[in-house]
């Protein structure tokens, strides 16, 4: 049968800067097609048990599936198909009109990048290593991308970079951070991750395979334009503040949905990973920029109104984002009580 469980079935995830998440496209007959989220009798804003797509994630060399549901961006020029029958079956599909199709998105866990453990520093008689220097961002939680502790490798030597009080004092322009994010193909620099986020933030119960490397480097030239001139070797040590960055290309991004009687209005729910939860009202939520973005993600028209619902219940829990826009949120913070839900109305493009 023609299904995504067939070992020869070709899928790809597009419209994202991560190969393990994006809009699902499938190859059938003579070309690639975008799959509509209304396929297999689902409604366009319904979320599925992601485990049903585990074979897809596996074949893409990604980790376990985290989410399967509507994707935010559509390419109107692409072949779009709606399929029928059992979820993941492509035996019976029809081409869909441009206006009715909402793409299906899939997020798989990013595989942990494993780096061979660095060897001991060579004896002083050995000539300097000649392999090109390289950088790596080591995320503390599996599947994170473009956020974490910076590791610098030069030849056989690899380690983290010291980032102490004096570096912070001199570091006003953040030229180095932008250069590092850009060298890592992670966009531009957003913020420094505090030590707690960088060195200890782990998903509960998750053991990190990649143990932190010792500090081997310090910043030599913060306006460097090639990696070999940025850092200098120091005597290795195992404690101290290290350079940890969050770049604009971080993944996974926060996803939002509106839960209500129509696609374009309802209480806002968010997730970053597997679990949906209510978005709590906060001072940063006052900006219309946040809600414009939410409306856009639902593929609705412009933002109409937002209303914070009464949080009389001390047990009401949710997630909040300290930034103006949800797309800037690297980590949602959990609110265990008095979470004021938010009701947003967007313009319905098809009233």
């Amino acid at each position: 049968r023609l299904s995504w469980d067939d070992p020869d079935f070709q899928t790809r995830l597009t419209r994202s800067n991560s190969r393990c998440q994006g809009q699902l496209e499938v190859y059938i007959k003579y070309g690639w097609h975008m799959v509509c989220s209304q396929s297999w009798g689902r409604s366009s804003n319904q979320w599925e048990d992601p485990n049903q797509a585990s074979k897809v994630c596996q074949r893409l060399n990604c980790g376990v599936p985290l989410s399967l549901g509507p994707f935010l961006i559509t390419d109107r020029h692409q072949s779009q198909i709606t399929c029928y029958g059992r979820l993941g079956s492509f035996s019976n599909c029809s081409h869909s009109g441009r206006d009715v199709c909402r793409p299906l998105g899939l997020t798989c866990l990013e595989p942990q990048t494993t780096t061979p453990p660095p060897t001991r520093p060579p004896p002083t008689t050995t000539p300097e290593p000649t392999a090109p220097p390289r950088l790596q961002l080591v995320a503390q939680a599996a599947g994170r991308h473009c956020a974490g502790v910076v590791e610098f490798y030069s030849g056989s030597l690899g380690g983290t970079i010291s980032y102490e009080a004096q570096d912070k004092a001199q570091d006003k322009t953040q030229v180095l951070e932008n250069f590092l994010c850009s060298s890592l193909q992670c966009g531009s620099f957003l913020k420094h991750l505090p030590e707690t986020e960088a060195a200890t933030a782990q998903d509960p119960g998750e053991l990190r395979e990649h143990q932190p490397l010792p500090i081997q480097w310090t910043i030599r030239n913060s306006s460097c334009t090639s990696l070999e001139h940025c850092f200098q070797k120091i005597k290795p040590r195992n404690s101290g503040q290290v350079l940890a960055l969050l770049c604009s290309g971080f993944q996974p991004k926060v996803q939002s949905r509106l839960v209500g009687s129509s696609i374009c209005e309802g209480t806002v729910e968010v997730r970053q990973g597997a679990q949906w939860a209510a978005l709590c009202d906060s001072s940063s939520a006052k900006s219309s920029l946040r809600w414009e973005e939410v409306c856009r993600e639902q593929q609705c028209g412009s933002f109409n109104s937002y209303q914070a619902l009464d949080a009389g219940d001390p047990t009401s829990r949710g997630l909040s984002c300290p930034h103006q826009k949800l797309s800037q949120c690297h980590e949602l913070t959990e609110r265990k009580s008095y979470c004021k839900k938010v009701f947003v109305t967007c313009q319905d493009p098809n009233p």
């Epitope: 049968r1 067939d6 003579y30 035996s91």
Partner: antibody
């Protein structure tokens, strides 16, 4: 095991219509994802894809020959047919019947070919 | 129509050699490329599909590589039975074949 066998008239005159039949076994065109098509090869030259028909009756034609070609199937009899109208001497070639799955695994099985000569 | 160009009509090799047959697409075809072997008087046989996946029963001395517009079929440790015509095929948009490369003995 999968086999495909072509049959055709052998010799025709210019402007006539060619009718080819492909009889296959070892798979069914009622199975989703299955397709059968036609490819030709003039003697000592390259391969040219002509047409393809799928399990769901979806058909694809080579855009440069579309107006001359008609492909059809009888899934219950395990047969696929190709008609080429308004023949020309340039249509002299060996015609192959091929199987291809919708997952894009290439033309995985080929018939032995039937030779057509178009001559006045 | 996407044009597939096999720039070498003929390639000479010796038994035990390694040979690479090139194929270039006129536009990006992703990895939707297959390779076929055809011996005189026989039908073509599928060797490789999706650029690098070997068809059932194909010896592992045949490997495919590439993506986008440039593709290569490599035969390591060439055997006398490998002397044949080789065709590349794109199926990203309809189907088009390369004109073929004949592998012959030096």
């Amino acid at each position: 095991q999968v086999t495909l066998k072509e049959s055709g008239p052998g010799i025709l005159k210019p402007s006539q219509t060619l009718s080819l039949t492909c009889s296959f076994s070892g798979f069914s065109l009622s199975t989703s994802g299955m397709g059968v098509g036609w490819i030709r090869q003039p003697s000592g030259k390259g391969l040219e894809w002509l047409a393809h028909i799928w399990w769901d009756d979806d058909v694809y034609y080579n855009p440069s020959l579309k107006n001359q070609l008609t492909i059809s199937k009888d899934a219950s009899r395990d047969q696929v047919f190709l008609k080429i109208t308004n023949l020309d001497t340039a249509d002299t070639a060996t015609y192959y019947c091929v199987r291809r799955r919708a997952t894009g695994t290439g033309f995985d099985y080929w018939g032995q070919g039937t030779t057509l000569t178009v001559s006045s | 129509n996407i044009v597939m160009t096999q720039s070498h009509k003929f390639m000479s090799t010796s038994v035990g050699d390694r040979v690479s047959i090139a194929c270039k697409a006129s536009q990006d075809v992703g990895t939707a490329v297959a390779w076929y072997q055809q011996k005189p008087g026989q039908s073509p046989k599928l060797l490789i599909y999706w650029t690098s996946t070997r068809h059932t029963g194909v010896p592992d001395r045949f490997t495919g590589s590439g993506s986008g517009t440039d593709f290569t079929l490599t035969i390591t440790n060439v055997q006398s039975e490998d002397l044949a015509d080789y065709f590349c095929h794109q199926y990203n948009s309809y189907n088009t074949f390369g004109s073929g490369t004949r592998l012959e003995l030096k």
